[in-house]
Structure formats: C-alpha cells, structure tokens
C-alpha cells in the first residue's frame, strides 16, 4: 500500500541496505524511491539529543514483509518509498538548504553573484551533483560569494554539516533545465575507451543507455551485444566517465554499441521504464517467487504488482501442462539489473513497469496517429479536454489540455464573464460532444488561475490553469501531454497539430467530433508582418499555411497546439487568437507555452 506521510520521532529497526546523507527527510524519501531495493528509510534530523555525526543520515532499508518494527527515537523521521505509490514522482529538487554544507569532492571553485547563479553553474556542468555557496555574510572574507561545485560516487553528499552563512542545493539536470548538449544517437560498432565506473548486465543498448542516464556518475556507455566475440562480456553494459565529460577515444569494434547519458535531456524520453519483452532470453537473479501465469504479459503484470520484483523470466507452458499456464519467475538483484543474461533457453524476460511512473506519464507511447482526414479517432489526443459552462445552459466553452493529474492548461480569455468555477465542467476522454449526457462523469473545477498580467488575448499572457476538484486517473483515453522544456527553446517542431471542437469556418457551429489539422509553425518575424497592427511577442507562437485553409477557430480556444519531437508529444501552444479563421496570410496566434513553464510550475507546485 502507498504511505506518503512521514513518521516523526520514529525509527525503523533493522533491514539496513546502505546509509547516505540527505539534507531533509523529504529528499531521503526520494533517494529511497530511486534506489533499486529500498522500501523504507529512517532519517535523522539535527537535534541537540543526537550525536552531530548522525545528523542528516538517511538509512535505506528493505524488508521481505515490506515493513519493519517501529521504535520511538527523538529526531528520527521514518517513512516508505514511493515505489508502492501510483502517483508520478520526480528526482527534481529545487530546494535550497540554508546553513548546510553538503560535502563531496570540490572540483571547481569560482565567484558567483548569487546562490541561483551557483545552482545554474552546477546544472550546466557535466560532473556537478550539488553545490555549496558562501553568501556575502560568510565570516571569511576570501570565501565570500564562492561557489563550490561538487560530485560524489553516489550523487548524494558524503556528509552534511551545519555551517553558518552558506547555502547548498542540487543540480537541476533532472528538472530538464541544463544547457548541456545532449547526444541521443547510439553509435553502432563503437567502443568508448574511457574509465569504467560500473558495469551491469543489459539485454540491449537502449536499456544500457537508460541505466547510464539515471546512474549518477555515468556520462556515456559501451554495450557489448550478444554476438560479441568474448562470451564472458556478452550483454555487458559498461558505464563510463571522463574528465572532459566526453569520450577521449572511439574505437571501431564490431558487435559493440556506444552512446551517452541523457541526463541533460531526460524530460522528453522515458529513462526508467524498460517496457520491451526479450524473447529466448533468461534473466538470472535472486528468486523472489515462482507463480503460474498465462502469458509473458501476465507475468510482467505480476512482477509490476510485486513491489520487490525488478525483472522476470517467463517459461511458456509445455503443451497441455498446468491448464496452459507457464511459470513466471519473479526476480531481483542488488542493482536492479540481471546478474547474468542467457540466450537460447526459450524464456521470455522483461522488467517491472513499476518504474514507469518515475518517468513523466506524458512520455508514454500513445496510439499511432491516423494519417489523413480531419476527424480524430478515440484516444488519438488523450490530453484534449472539453470545458463546458453550465450557465445559462450547458455548452462547450473552450478546449484545454491535461498537464497533471489535477491540472488543465487553457487560455485566459475563455473565462471572460465566468464569475465562479462552480459553473465549469471538464470532460476528458471525449471524442464526440454528443457523448456528453446528464449522467456523463466530469471533473469539477476547484480554482481558476489566470495569469496576473493577462488583459486581452491579443496582448499576450493568454494562459490559465484549472485546478480540478478530483484527480484524473490516467488511461489510454485520458493522459497528460508533456510541457516543452526550457532546454528545448531551439527545437524546430515540424509535426504540429491543432485540435478542437470549434467552428470549421467563421460562421458555423461547434463540431460534434474532435477535429484535427496539421499546421506548420511560422517564425515570429513572418507572423509580425501579417499582423502589423499587433505586437507579436516572444511569448506568442504562430502557425498556419500561407494560403490559409487550415486553422483553429471559435471554440478551439484554450486547446492544444501539440507537436511531436523525439517520439514525444509536447504542448507547444495554446490556441489564443487570430484574424478570422484560416484566412490567407493570417496565421493563428498561440500562447508560447515554453515561455510560461516557470509560471506553470510555480502555480501547480505551490503547497
């Protein structure tokens, strides 16, 4: 079961796996969640009753029964990993810790104007895990405004001590805020000849790359495939680093593949979720259980539902044995990877999908797009919602996009004249407006948050958030879309679609079936030429055909301009305004979402 609250003055007895140092119990819980085996933890806060050498210790624990005896201890805070929870989790930690010195290898020291600048420097440095910044009130004159960049083998501090007038914090690479270049390619027939920091077994180069991405010290990797000549090295994934952060040499070698950690770009691709099945492949590891299962898919489900299971091997049933059920071997290891991988024994192997929630839900593959035609099919745009008003009578008001399990992103101009959120209803998973009957379930709106600089659509800031009264359970027909990353400002999107139930021409009516149109983006310079009487700002983005013919229109407002990049859909724009609909040389103008990512995060993450 999922237990999110922390247990004050409580210590879990036994079950220790390892001890790390974290600045808070909250962060200890995150570290436990990302550790392959940790199910529970005990954190020791600073306290006069505690030995200072034990302050900030985070003891990661495991238990076969998924719980441990509790003992009362002042200053101890205990809790459970989020592995048992279904909600999405993130390693992103923007907290700044005052008067704490997080110890590690100080490999870079420079002057910075502020803690924020120091944190940015850490985020943009390939080796940096965390930093300590001496403020201008720091007693020692020569150390004031010094920014120390630090790294450790584990990515967490080796110790944390109290130190007046310093602040510490973590790199924001896992918040997708790094400017480091990201190389997504995997290079066939290539070995990187740099120092190995670790090695694990992996079934393919993609899994190897994902393991590298969430390993704190790995910057690039080399994977030896199952055809590699040296048998003892087959399926070996070597995690590597170098001083420069790049491979010093690439050696041409057949049957090896190499690539890079995607730590600087992991906002737009799943890195924890290994969802493939590996046929004629056996994963070896510590056996947790053997269960009868009808198929390898059923076996994967069993593994996902068993919180300690990390991977599995399924052996199909022999002819008529056991009612056609095969054996499902649920397994685990110290690092979450198989201890050995064998081929040619007929097994089907794979990994738990429990870790998929550590990737943003929005990166999950959705139904393939239907090419051609203007009417959408069910599940094609699962983030699209229809926002209804019930006053004076119920009708479609605007579109919107699911961006979190309690959040809809839409346009501010939709709420002109809307006095209260009570008259609003959000319907998700809808294809046809005619599906909406009196008994159709909907989400009530708890709060409307309109950007405080919004005046009118044409002058920008046409963005609003709806906080829902209840949470959305993600399914194939209702799931979130990724926000663009600030690191993606230079991306040129070429596969963009506008969707909505709006008019198909200027004088028309709301459409029954959700409509879609592929529309090219237009540069802001080009767009400005088409709207001489308006100021097209960098906070707006334009899309449309020069000859017109396809565009958003009345009723589409607030809906998404969705663009696919690296196989992931991003909410690039919010339908805002335009001159007429689909007119020649009059592109549609959309709110440029990337420019509001900080605003969105500030509003949706506020306690």
């Amino acid at each position: 079961e999922c237990v999110t609250q922390l247990l004050k003055d409580t210590c879990f007895e036994g079950g220790d796996i390892t001890t790390v140092f974290t600045p808070s119990a909250k962060y200890c819980q995150v570290v436990c969640t990302y550790h392959p085996r940790c199910l529970l933890f005990t954190f020791t806060a600073e306290s006069p009753s505690e030995d200072p050498t034990r302050w900030f210790t985070c003891v990661l624990k495991d238990s076969v029964t998924e719980t441990l005896p509790r003992v009362n201890r002042t200053a101890a805070i205990s809790g459970y990993s989020f592995k048992q929870c279904s909600h999405q989790i993130s390693a992103c930690n923007k907290d700044i810790y005052v008067d704490l010195d997080m110890k590690g290898i100080n490999y870079n020291s420079s002057v910075a104007k502020s803690a924020q600048e120091c944190q940015e420097r850490c985020t943009d440095d390939v080796h940096c895990h965390f930093f300590t910044y001496a403020t201008r009130q720091f007693p020692s004159l020569e150390h004031r405004n010094i920014c120390l960049l630090k790294h450790t083998q584990t990515g967490t501090p080796t110790r944390i001590t109290k130190l007046d007038k310093v602040v510490s914090g973590f790199s924001l690479k896992s918040c997708a805020l790094s400017n480091l270049a990201c190389i997504r390619d995997i290079f066939p027939n290539t070995v990187f000849a740099d120092s190995n920091i670790d090695s694990v077994m992996a079934p393919d180069a993609f899994v190897c790359g994902r393991i590298c991405t969430h390993h704190p010290g790995c910057l690039f990797f080399t994977f030896f495939s199952q055809e590699w000549p040296k048998e003892s090295q087959r399926n070996l994934c070597l995690l590597k680093t170098s001083e420069s952060g790049l491979p010093s040499t690439r050696i041409k070698k057949s049957k090896a593949l190499s690539g890079f950690s995607l730590q600087s770009c992991r906002h737009s691709i799943p890195v924890f979720c290994h969802s493939s099945f590996y046929h004629d492949t056996d994963f070896l590891g510590e056996e947790l259980d053997i269960v009868a299962a009808k198929s390898h898919e059923a076996c994967q489900k069993l593994c996902t539902n068993a919180v300690r299971c990390q991977f599995f091997t399924y052996t199909p049933a022999q002819a008529s044995c056991n009612e056609g059920k095969g054996k499902c071997y649920l397994k685990l290891s110290s690092n979450g990877s198989p201890t050995k991988i064998l081929h040619g024994r007929g097994g089907i192997s794979g990994y738990t999908l429990r870790l998929c929630k550590m990737d943003n839900e929005c990166t999950t593959k959705i139904k393939p797009r239907i090419v051609g035609g203007t009417a959408s099919v069910r599940g094609e745009w699962p983030w699209q919602v229809t926002l209804h008003t019930t006053s004076p009578t119920q009708r479609h008001l605007c579109g919107g996009s699911i961006i979190g399990n309690q959040w809809i992103l839409t346009a501010a101009h939709c709420f002109y004249g809307v006095e209260s959120p009570k008259i609003l209803r959000v319907y998700s998973g809808i294809l046809n407006q005619s599906e909406i009957k009196e008994d159709t379930s909907f989400f009530g709106v708890q709060e409307i948050i309109i950007h405080d600089q919004y005046k009118m659509a044409e002058s920008g800031y046409d963005i609003a958030l709806l906080k829902l009264e209840t949470t959305v359970n993600y399914t194939d027909s209702q799931r979130p879309i990724c926000l663009p990353s600030k690191g993606d400002r230079n991306v040129i999107y070429t596969d963009c679609w506008v969707t909505g139930w709006g008019y198909r021409k200027l004088r028309d009516k709301i459409q029954n079936t959700l409509q879609k149109a592929k529309i090219p983006l237009v540069t802001n310079e080009e767009c400005q030429k088409r709207y001489r009487g308006h100021k097209i700002t960098h906070k707006m983005i334009c899309a449309g055909y020069r000859e017109g013919g396809k565009d958003a229109c009345k009723g589409d407002s607030g809906g998404p301009l969705s663009c696919k990049h690296n196989e992931v859909w991003h909410l690039v724009g919010i339908t805002s305004w335009g001159e007429g609909c689909a007119q020649r040389e009059r592109p549609g103008v959309y709110t440029n979402v990337v420019e509001y990512v900080d605003w969105i995060l500030e509003k949706t993450q506020a306690v």
Epitope: E120, R121, D124, D125, V126, N179, L180, A181, I183, S244, G245, L246, P247, S248, T249, R250, G487, N490
Partner: nanobody, 122 residues
Framework: QVQLVESGGGLVQPGGSLRLSCAAS????????MAWFRQAPGKEREGVAL????????SYTDSVKGRFTISQDNSKNTVYLQMNSLRAEDTAVYYC???????????????WGQGTLVTVSS
C-alpha cells in the same frame, strides 16, 4: 592562455554559402569543446554548432541542421563552419568559443573570438 581568431564572414545572397574559420592558438589541448555561437541585433547569443575536440562528436541547433557543417583540422588547430542555403534569419555576428563543457550555454565557454559578421541579403 587561448586565443581564437575568426574569419570568413561577409555579405551573401539568400541561398548562398560561406565558410567560417576559427584559428586557435595557445593552450588549446585543455579545451574539450569548440563551438560556434551567433548573435543577431537585439537578440540573445545562441549556440549554432558544437564539436568535441578529441572525439569529434558534433551537435547542431535545429534551425541549421542539414545546412551547416562544423568540422575541425587538428593539424592546423582550426575549426570550420560551412554554411549552405543561407537565409536572411542567419544574419548575425558569429563567434567562435572554446571551453571544457559540451554545452549550449555561452557561460560554459571560457575563451571567445572577436566575432565575424555574416549578412544574408539580396
């Protein structure tokens, strides 16, 4: 100390080509990456292309992919930017930069050239 000197800028018609050169001298083998940045009037400096000096890995910003090519000649300590199919929006001062990080952030580069102007106009 590292010195970087760019050359090759000039006026070119839309659709035309230019080749920029950046000659590096001094303690260059400490540099992990070389980059071309550009700055158009009234805009922020943006990364165009990066090259890892030892291993030759390359990265381009989306707007120049397929049109620009970054390359290096280690014997001459020179990095080149071959620019084809130039557009009006490529008009900017182009800077060569050297640093230890393979990064799109100008702040990651310790050494900069003086810049060379590229104007694309008919």
């Amino acid at each position: 100390q590292v010195q970087l000197v760019e050359s090759g800028g000039g006026l070119v018609q839309p659709g035309g080509s230019l080749r920029l050169s950046c000659a590096a001298s001094g303690y260059t083998y400490s540099m992990g990456a070389m980059a071309w940045f550009r700055q158009a009037p009234g805009k922020e400096r943006e990364g165009v292309a990066l090259i890892a000096t030892s291993s030759g890995f390359i990265s381009y910003t989306d707007s120049v992919k397929g049109r620009f090519t970054i390359s290096q000649d280690n014997s001459k300590n020179t990095v080149y930017l071959q620019m084809n199919s130039l557009r009006a929006e490529d008009t900017a001062v182009y800077y060569c930069a050297a640093g230890t990080q393979f990064s799109w952030s100008p702040g990651s580069y310790n050494y900069w050239g003086q810049g060379t102007l590229v104007t694309v106009s008919s």
